[in-house]
Amino acid sequence: RQQWELQGDRRCQSQLERANLRPCEQHLMQKIQRDEDSYGRDPYSPSQDPYSPSPYDRRGAGSSQHQERCCNELNEFENNQRCMCEALQQIMENQSDRLQGRQQEQQFKRELRNLPQQCGLRAPQRCDLEVESGGRDRY
């Protein structure tokens, strides 16, 4: 069993290394920013990310592209729920520094939990998305 887990971990590690999780990150950021825009947030505030959604994208146009590519990437983990969880954790960790305040972090986490389901995939049963202040080791 230990041997199997070790092989599984290695397989998951290589799967994660070949996955492009950026479209998932962009898709989720678009979602929470769209929600904020509808509550009066300035949609023209500058961003550090060259591929962050433009105000036009945030109104829905272009967002389906990030979602489609994101779902394709997550689909690669469908047979390995633990690895799917690792992918979600990686997305959370990669974006944690860009989330402003507890509210945005909770919102991002909520959307992230729903992501597999949105893609028509099984969501991992137990998946801790808390990011420790020191940051989780990314392999």
Epitope: Q26, P50, Y51, P53, Q65, E68, N75
Partner: antibody, heavy 122, light 108 residues
Framework: QQLKESGGGLVKPGGSLKLCCKA?????????MNWVRQAPGKGLEWIGS????????YYADSVKGRFTLSRDNAQSTVCLQLNSLTAADTATYFC????????????????WGPGTLVTVSS | YVMMTQTPSSVSEAVGGTVTIYCRAS???????LVWYQQKPGQPPKLLIY???TRATGVPSRFRGSGSGTQFTLTISGMKAEDVATYYC?????????FGGGTEVVVK
């Protein structure tokens, strides 16, 4: 890092053909693969893509239901089965490796095969 | 289905001149999914620019990609004879991953 298509040739309308693309010099199972065709003197037409573990396969509307994409990671090969061929399918068929920028995320086709010519004529 | 329209279909420019190629998408395309390729006669396409503005490895700085939303541009500043080719834009965010019709660049 190389790709090489094979299987092209002359085929009659309504006929079938199987094109394959053999990869070398890189870990094939790490990459999504795509097929693009180009009719003589015309532009590029994307015809299909297959993800690393074959879990997601897409086709252009013009070939849907007639062409089938498959891959064998152990053999580092991606194949395209062409059925119900018409003169409109006459083209050079390219396979292309899809990669992405690890830091920022954009996808692109960075390695292409030289292409294989398919001629559909009676 | 995102349709990509390139203009002009052909352009003639003197060596040293500037060539501007436009690519219009029928709906908004994220910069992340906009790519430019160069194809010379008898050869497969070659990656030029990805992410709308990032030059691929080994691509000279005279090639510049810009734009966002539905309007994208490829500019060749200080055209060289070796730049004679057909240039294609492609969106690869939504399947089908469509190419523009191509722009043939020739030397005047």
């Amino acid at each position: 890092q190389q790709l090489k298509e094979s299987g092209g040739g002359l085929v009659k309308p309504g006929g079938s053909l199987k094109l394959c693309c053999k990869a070398s010099g890189f870990t094939f199972s790490d990459y999504n693969m795509n097929w693009v065709r180009q009719a003589p003197g015309k532009g590029l037409e994307w015809i299909g893509s297959i993800t690393r573990s074959s879990r997601t396969i897409y086709y252009a509307d013009s070939v849907k239901g007639r062409f089938t994409l498959s891959r064998d990671n152990a053999q580092s090969t991606v194949c395209l089965q062409l059925n119900s061929l018409t003169a409109a399918d006459t083209a050079t068929y390219f396979c292309a490796r899809e990669d992405f920028n690890v830091y920022t995320g954009p996808y692109y086709y960075d390695v292409w095969g030289p292409g294989t010519l398919v001629t559909v004529s009676s | 289905y995102v349709m990509m329209t390139q203009t002009p279909s052909s352009v003639s420019e003197a060596v040293g001149g500037t060539v501007t190629i436009y690519c219009r998408a029928s709906q908004s395309v994220s910069n992340m999914f906009l790519v430019w390729y160069q194809q010379k006669p008898g050869q497969p396409p070659k990656l030029l620019i990805y992410g709308a503005s990032t030059r691929a490895t080994g691509v000279p700085s005279r090639f510049r990609g810009s734009g966002s939303g539905t309007q994208f541009t490829l500019t060749i500043s200080g055209m060289k004879a070796e730049d004679v080719a057909t240039y294609y834009c492609q969106q690869n965010g939504n399947s089908p991953y469509t190419f523009g019709g191509g722009t043939e660049v020739v030397v005047k």
